[in-house]
């Protein structure tokens, strides 16, 4: 950067280099010339020179005003005009940042993916800083007392076997720059409540020619845990609003929901499971689309696979890709 | 056994700097763990200053009233740790005290000898 | 800013008798309180951690108890070695930019 370069001077700014947006602040330049008694100094913003509210000081100094200054970074330098000089002489260069203190972090949660081997912690940072904000997560045993601590810049995955003080724990997570220190409030947790079961993924979808056509969404999960709740929501393409259904499921065999829908609709179907009693849920799983037949059953598959037309009595509709769910950070 | 040696000059001039250091064997210097000094002025309670937590990164801690005067530094080559408190003035006349337990909790099993540091011209 | 506050500020005692000392946090602090006994001259010893654990070669008269904001020290059988000062401690959390002491005020326990 331009703090780099070899100074004839000595370049410093006022409150300090990095300092609140929106702040007023002063630029002072103090060159050191040999044989240089500078005619004018001059003020560079990113390779720009500044016109206006410039101050001499003394003989060497001089200072550069800015009222209400909102640019996140600049790189400033100033230069002199020396007698006998035909080109102006770089005095001193110095990188400044405005930003502000971080808020207090807030909505702290923490989650094992089954079979992740890691307990992974988010919270809300509150508004953008503009400068480096660095966070500390602290894991605390409620069982022993001991503290680890988990330096990051977002979010943390921690090893669940570094976590051996027990099942219980506090968490907080502490932001921290330049400009300011602050300190979310302490979540506890115990880590047999924060698993959340293996992905729940919609693999095929059947609409059945009977009396009252039916249609039978296949889902699964490779989760190891015994009591799960599923929420199954679904709604035709046009529409806005969710349809939504509830089951308690044994994933030891392929789930079968069936569900009775009109004819010639395309429709979007998303799981999701939680532990059955516990806080948090899966993400929405991909989107799954679905045609049902005019009268005739159809297969369609899932996003951006055409749809396929079927002469026989079922239609099916076969999961093959990976569309990201527009919720996919709905774990609460 | 975790030791904690305190050293450091008894007098030092209104004005000037508090400089203590707190030297420690006996501890898994690859673990976590917090060293933190407390004062005790004469006839009064115990008074927390700061800590130092030292893991796979180190953070430092100090009581609000001390801010802006206090640092505490870690000097790990040495196994040993810092504190330094400026602009002393009598009030600051106390015994020093460094503490640890040689883990990542915050009481405290082992303190150092303590020293008694007067502020006086 | 979590404060602690303990309380009496000092008590007469005769050896044999039961006492007890009550500190309380300004706001929750789970288990996370120490006890230590000091005497004159000397640095504090640790009596009790985690609220209610007894450190290591410390006498079974003592215990602790409590959670959240209130906690007790108690003395079964007050001996003539146990007259000194004690304070309690919260060792919940000091990353907190606001904490001013992390220790109780003292009480002195004296011969009656």
């Known amino acids: 950067g331009i703090t780099n370069i070899n100074c004839s001077g000595h370049i410093w700014v006022e409150p300090a280099t990095i300092f609140k947006m929106g702040m007023n602040i002063s630029i002072y330049c103090q060159a050191a010339i040999k044989n240089c008694q500078p005619r004018k100094l001059h003020f560079y913003k990113n390779g720009i020179k500044e016109r206006f509210q410039i101050t001499r000081i003394n003989k060497t100094t001089a200072r550069l005003w800015y009222k209400n200054f909102l640019e996140p970074h600049a790189s400033m330098y100033c230069t002199a005009e020396c007698p006998k000089h035909f080109q102006e002489t770089l005095i001193c260069g110095k990188d400044i940042s405005s930003g502000y203190p971080p808020d207090i972090p807030d909505e702290v949660t923490c989650v094992i993916y089954e079979y992740s081997g890691n307990m992974t912690c988010t919270w809300n940072a509150g508004k953008l800083t503009y400068i480096d904000t660095k966070y500390v997560v602290h894991v605390k045993s409620l069982e022993t007392e001991e503290e680890q601590q988990y330096l990051t810049s977002s979010y943390i995955n921690i090893s669940t076997d570094s976590l051996q003080g027990g099942k219980k724990y506090l968490v907080w997570v502490q932001a921290a720059n330049a400009l300011g220190m602050e300190e979310s409030k302490q979540l506890q947790i115990h880590l047999d409540d924060i698993v959340i079961p293996s992905a729940a993924v919609i693999s095929r979808a059947e609409t059945i020619n009977a009396t009252v056509p039916k249609t039978i969404i296949y889902w699964d999960s490779q989760t190891t845990i015994e009591k799960v709740s599923c929420e199954m929501r679904y709604k035709a393409t046009t529409n806005q609003t969710w349809n939504v259904k509830e089951f308690d499921t044994n994933f030891t065999y392929v789930q079968q929901s069936e569900f009775y829908l009109e004819p010639n609709i395309k429709y979007v179907f998303q799981v999701r499971c939680q532990e059955t009693g516990k806080r948090y849920w899966q993400p929405w799983s991909s989107l799954f689309f679905h045609k049902t037949p005019e009268t005739v059953p159809q297969v369609t598959s899932k996003a951006f696979q055409h749809d396929t037309w079927n002469s026989g009595l079922t239609v099916a509709s076969i999961s093959t890709g990976h569309l990201t769910s527009d919720n996919r950070g709905d774990i609460g | 056994q975790v030791q904690l040696q305190q050293s450091g000059p008894g007098l030092v001039k209104p004005s000037q700097t508090l400089s203590l250091t707190c030297a420690i064997s006996?501890?898994?210097?690859?673990?976590?763990?917090?060293m933190c000094w407390i004062r005790q002025s004469p006839g009064r309670g115990l008074e927390w200053l700061g800590c130092i937590y030292v893991g796979s990164h180190v953070n430092t801690y100090y009581a609000n009233w001390a801010k802006g005067r206090i640092t505490i530094n870690p000097d790990t080559s040495k196994n040993q740790f810092s504190l330094q408190l400026n602009s002393v003035t009598p009030e600051d006349t106390a015994v020093y005290y460094c503490a640890t337990s040689g883990s990542s909790v915050l009481y405290f099993k082992f303190w150092g000898q303590g020293t008694l540091v007067t502020v006086s011209s | 800013d979590i404060q602690m506050t303990q309380s009496p500020s000092s008590l007469s005692a005769s050896v044999g008798d039961r006492v007890t000392i009550t500190c309380q946090a300004s706001e929750n602090i789970y288990s996370f309180l120490a006890w230590y006994q000091q005497k004159p001259g000397k640095a504090p010893k640790l009596l009790i951690y985690?609220?209610?654990k007894l450190a290591a070669g410390v006498p079974s008269r003592f215990s602790g108890s409590g959670s959240g904001t209130d906690f007790t020290l108690t003395i079964s059988s007050l001996q003539p070695e146990d007259f000194a000062t004690y304070y309690c401690?919260?060792?919940?959390?000091?990353?907190?930019?606001?904490?001013?002491?992390?220790f109780g005020q003292g009480t002195k326990v004296e011969i009656k």
């Open positions: 401690q919260q060792t919940n959390r000091y990353s907190n930019p606001d904490i001013y002491n992390v």
């Open positions: 985690s609220a209610s």
């Open positions: 006996g501890i898994d210097f690859n673990s976590n763990y917090y």
